[in-house]
């Protein structure tokens, strides 16, 4: 069934290219296994940024080479995306799936617009 997912409308990445936001879902049941996916949407292109499946009460585990890290607390997932550059500015959508036990639920957030500004290079000092 459909599930509501809330996320902030806008986030500004830090000068080090790190952006964090909370993805909160209104769980209709008591899920024990949750899958969280971050999608980037630009025009008609949608790409998967990262994904993690976790057991409630445990840490999110992304792949070793993932640019994402995260923690969970109840129905909230705190997501951090690293290594962002200006060209990565875009709409980042939080997708939450309650995988187990049945019934399966899917929720898609409206997206967080992440703005990334490349830092100005430091001027050479004499």
């Amino acid at each position: 069934k459909a599930m509501h997912v809330a996320q902030p409308a806008v986030v500004l990445a830090s000068s080090r290219g790190i952006a964090s936001f909370v993805c909160e879902y209104a769980s209709p049941g008591k899920a024990t296994e949750v899958r969280v996916t971050v999608l980037r949407q630009a025009d008609s292109q949608v790409t998967e940024v990262c994904a993690a499946t976790y057991m409630m009460g445990n840490e999110l585990t992304f792949l070793d080479d993932s640019i994402c890290t995260g923690t969970s607390s109840g129905n909230q997932v705190n997501l951090t995306i690293q290594g962002l550059r200006a060209m990565d500015t875009g709409l980042y959508i939080c997708k939450v799936e309650l995988m187990y036990p049945p019934p399966y639920y899917l929720g898609i957030g409206n997206g967080t617009q992440i703005y990334v500004i490349d830092p100005e290079p430091c001027p050479d000092s004499d």
Epitope: K1, A2, R35, T37, L39, Q41, S44, Q45, V46, T47, E48, I93, K95, E97, P103, Y104, Y105, L106, I108
Partner: nanobody, 135 residues
């Protein structure tokens, strides 16, 4: 710019057939799911059928199963809805809609046809084509 254009609607007698086309531009079907929806006067828009282009999986509303068939031609970037044994209750404006496959269940079939036939799942919509079944 994403565009969906439906065609093939018209007036047909009960028991007759029609083939609706949905021509997509601005994106390739490969990664998208295309759904057909219909809306009769005074009624809510309802899901009819859906095809997930990446793997060809299809979904149908119970009311059209065995009568309607959805197919795709990726080379033409077009999805078809073949409608047979039409009934007066099939009279409606038919719309096609598109959503990227990543915004649907990770594993095909999870949640049955629910997400594939739900209007709120879709991002892009065509203008619709009228189908009238009457003698």
């Amino acid at each position: 710019e994403v565009q969906l254009v439906e065609s093939g609607g018209g007036l047909v007698q009960p028991g007759g057939s029609l083939r609706l086309s949905c021509a997509a531009s601005g994106f390739t079907l490969d990664y998208y799911a295309i759904g057909w929806f219909r809306q009769a006067p005074g009624k809510e828009r309802e899901g009819v059928s859906c095809i997930v282009s990446s793997d060809g999986s299809t979904y149908y509303a119970d009311s059209v199963k065995s009568r309607f068939t959805i197919s795709r031609d990726n080379a033409k970037n077009t999805v078809y809805l073949h409608m047979n044994s039409l009934k007066p209750e099939d009279t409606a404006v038919y719309y096609c809609a598109a959503v990227h496959g990543l915004k649907l269940p990770t594993l095909r079939g999870l949640g049955g046809s629910y997400y594939y036939l739900q209007a709120r799942s879709y991002d892009y919509w065509g203008q619709g084509t009228q189908v009238t079944v009457s003698s």
